[in-house]
């Protein structure tokens, strides 16, 4: 059952899903100048059986200029760099993920994918919160939110997290503390987290191995 509301907004915090529950949908969005192929599904869907979960349908983008063709346009050098970075991020995140029964991992990028991923979560999904760089967790309970359903209405539980001050960010479950504080890195060497809406993941350039893709907070 789809969650028909959004995870709570925590000031100075972002969230991400470690894995995606079966039933989760991911919009097949294309970058500017490209569109989803006519025969293509508008979504990828996390499906599975008792032993294995995977993403159904593959997102495919084609040039908006190309008529009646599904041929992939070779990206320009700048685009290739962007795509390669996204692949690197995805591989890092996959390495970070635990294989949970009934869950899918982060799907690999597709050619000419949009910079934001829009997910539609289902009841039972858990997302984990982390204070953004420069803020720390002041009051720590479970820094997570779960989509629950009561009387046919969906809601997300309130994460017990308050972000304050100016120290290193807290870590997601299973992530190691960085060797050096990210505060010591120039801004150009860290990824910027842009606030977006409705289960969007902002894929930004990652320059350090400690950087992950985060599902961002809401505006």
């Amino acid at each position: 059952e789809l969650c028909d509301d959004d995870p709570p907004k925590i000031t100075h915090a972002t969230f991400k899903a470690v894995a995606y529950k079966e039933g989760t949908m991911l919009n097949c969005e294309c970058k500017r100048g490209f569109r989803r192929i006519k025969s293509g599904s508008p979504y990828m869907l996390c499906t599975g059986n008792s032993s294995h979960s995977s993403w159904d349908n593959q997102c495919q983008c084609t040039s908006s200029a190309a008529r009646n063709t599904t041929k992939q346009v070779t990206p320009q050098p700048e685009e290739q760099k962007e795509r390669k970075t996204t692949e690197m991020q995805s591989q890092m995140q996959l390495a970070d993920q635990v294989s949970l029964p009934g869950h899918c991992r982060e799907p690999p990028p597709w050619e000419n994918e949009a910079t934001e991923r829009i997910y539609h979560f289902v009841v039972g999904q858990t997302v984990y919160y982390q204070c953004v760089q420069g803020y720390r967790a002041l009051h720590r309970g479970p820094a997570e939110s779960v989509c629950k359903m009561t009387h046919g209405k969906t809601r997300w539980t309130q994460p017990q997290l308050i972000c304050t001050g100016e120290t290193e960010p807290s870590q997601f479950p299973g992530e190691e503390e960085p060797q050096a504080s990210p505060d010591g890195l120039p801004e150009s060497e860290t990824s910027r987290l842009v606030t977006t809406t409705d289960f969007r993941i902002q894929t930004e350039v990652a320059a350090t191995m400690e950087t992950f893709i985060f599902t961002t907070e809401y505006q």
Partner: antibody, heavy 116, light 106 residues
Amino acid sequence: QVQLVQSGAEVKKPGSSVKVSCKASGYTFTSYRMHWVRQAPGQGLEWMGYINPSSGYTEYNQKFKDKATITADESTNTAYMELSSLRSEDTAVYYCARGGGVFDYWGQGTLVTVSS
Amino acid sequence: DIQMTQSPSTLSASVGDRVTITCSASSSISYMHWYQQKPGKAPKLLIYTTSNLASGVPARFSGSGSGTEFTLTISSLQPDDFATYYCHQRSTYPLTFGQGTKVEVK
């Protein structure tokens, strides 16, 4: 009490546009998505899409992606759905329905008639 | 898209009859929801998450099922129950409804 009050019936010419409104009261407008459902004469219900009033994010049924544009105005607690390039087959009753799960509250419906 | 097929499309019954409407989904879904609609009125939530009665709905209504097959039952049809009933899934986009079952006077 929760109420969704829609704008009145409209008669439009083919090719024109129409904007249907849905004014919400009795709850926090930005806390629930607003969905739109259409019902052609003598036909069943079809989900068209929704808007998240707090962010402006919209999700559409692909069938209506080029037909409908859903917007919301937080200041007046009103959701809108604009239908463009009207054709006779767009003649229907259009409903807004409060989301957050099952549709527990519905507007009274707005009949849009497209006729030359 | 998940197709929802209701049967029968029209059902002729009398007050006091036990009425059963079935809804078949083209793919497995988590829950089914049911709405009742009377002519010229907006749909009204009847049953949510397969078997739970919405507020104010009489106990003569019940719902059951799982996977792809779901049922709405009215144990003893009352005059107020003559209406059209729709099943609805919100397990995946686009959200879809059944084509409706009209319960009319026999």
